[in-house]
């Protein structure tokens, strides 16, 4: 049920995949990662509106609820919907590995 | 990767399970569901602080990079896990069916 | 326009061996890192390999440590990964990319269409 996908607050404000670079020391993993030295981060940003790229019915219903109950029940929220995986190599007591993690980069988003 | 369940917050601020009572009217349901005529929505709702229930790497990062820069990456947030499914008994054409939503009610939260 | 094409795949038993080659065409293979990644039935895909371009280091993920040899011969533009000692969980699609340093990710600006490898007796 991934409703409409057009922004009712204007171009790029609504859920969207966002890239944000990072250094190894900015995630906190300069001790244990050798490379990438530098991380390109996608994420999902932006304001979820009124069933703008709505998940599924628990987020239809939470923006039925939000716009009744504003201070009690949240917008829904911008979060990945697939991730892609991303390779790393890191250190090991014996040396060095690659190491795969699936859900680390967000691929795709949508409002939850 | 579920990271801490200590909130740090005081205890039921942090991201957990809530039952908001809806009727249909309030879900916008009124025209196509029978019954029932009131809904315990169960939802995810509260603040996501620094490993709260992380759900993933993804969500470790999001807390990383909120910290450095956090006009530009919004802090995790409280989204279901997991559904338990509920069922509605619905208006049709030529009656009334049960029809059984798996993404509707909120079953466990996390933070991403 | 940038392209790789692997081949080498096949069925083999349990404790058999292939060789897959990755063959660049577009652009030379030596100014970049090439990485072998697998898919397995219903799996995520998995970073298995990466030789650098500039000092030729090699990586391997643990679970192909010790059997799995990657390795280039770029007056070929070709880059090969010898597998040794394989086994039933080795089955996967294998694919070569390329980018411009190790690791190389799954959104590198070369990728190969894959080559199936299964270890079945």
């Known amino acids: 049920a991934r409703n409409g996908d057009h922004c009712p607050l204007g171009p790029g404000r609504c859920c969207r995949l966002h890239t944000v670079r990072a250094s190894l020391e900015d995630l906190g993993w300069a001790d244990w990662v050798l490379s990438p030295r530098e991380v390109q981060v996608t994420m999902c940003i932006g304001a979820c509106p009124s069933q703008f790229r709505a998940a599924n019915m628990h987020a239809q219903i939470k923006t039925s609820l939000h716009r009744l109950k504003p201070d009690t029940v949240p917008a829904p929220c911008c979060v990945p919907a697939s991730y892609n995986p991303m390779v790393l190599i890191q250190k090991t007591d014996t040396g060095v590995s690659l190491q795969t993690y699936d859900d680390l980069l967000a691929k795709d988003c949508h409002c939850i | 990767a579920r990271n801490g369940d200590h909130c740090p917050l005081g205890p039921g601020r942090c991201c957990r399970l809530h039952t908001v009572r809806a009727s249909l009217e309030d879900l916008g349901w009124a025209d196509w569901v029978l019954s029932p005529r009131e809904v315990q929505v169960t939802m995810c709702i509260g603040a996501c602080p620094s490993q709260f229930r992380a759900a993933n790497m993804h969500a470790q990062i999001k807390t990383s990079l909120h910290r450095l820069k956090p006009d530009t990456v919004p802090a995790p947030c409280c989204v279901p896990a997991s559904y338990n499914p509920m069922v509605l008994i619905q208006k049709t054409d030529t009656g009334v069916s049960l029809q059984t939503y798996d993404d509707l009610l909120a079953k466990d939260c996390h933070c991403i | 326009q940038l392209q790789l094409v692997e081949s080498g795949g096949g069925l083999v038993q349990p404790g058999g061996s292939l060789r897959l080659s990755c063959v660049a065409s577009?652009?030379?293979?030596?100014?970049?890192?090439i990485g072998w990644f697998r898919q397995a039935p219903g799996k995520g895909l998995e970073g298995v390999s990466c030789?650098?371009?500039?000092?030729?280091?090699?990586y391997y993920a643990d679970s192909v440590k010790g059997r799995f040899t990657i390795s280039r011969d770029n007056a070929k533009n070709t880059a090969y990964l010898q597998m040794n000692s394989l086994k039933p969980e080795d089955t996967a699609i294998y694919y070569c990319?390329?980018?411009?340093?190790?690791?190389?990710?799954?959104?590198?600006?070369?990728w190969g269409q894959g080559t199936q490898v299964t270890v079945s007796s």
């Open positions: 990319a390329a980018d411009t340093e190790c690791p190389v990710q799954v959104t590198s600006m070369a």
């Open positions: 577009g652009f030379t293979l030596d100014d970049y890192a």
């Open positions: 030789i650098s371009s500039s000092d030729e280091s090699t």
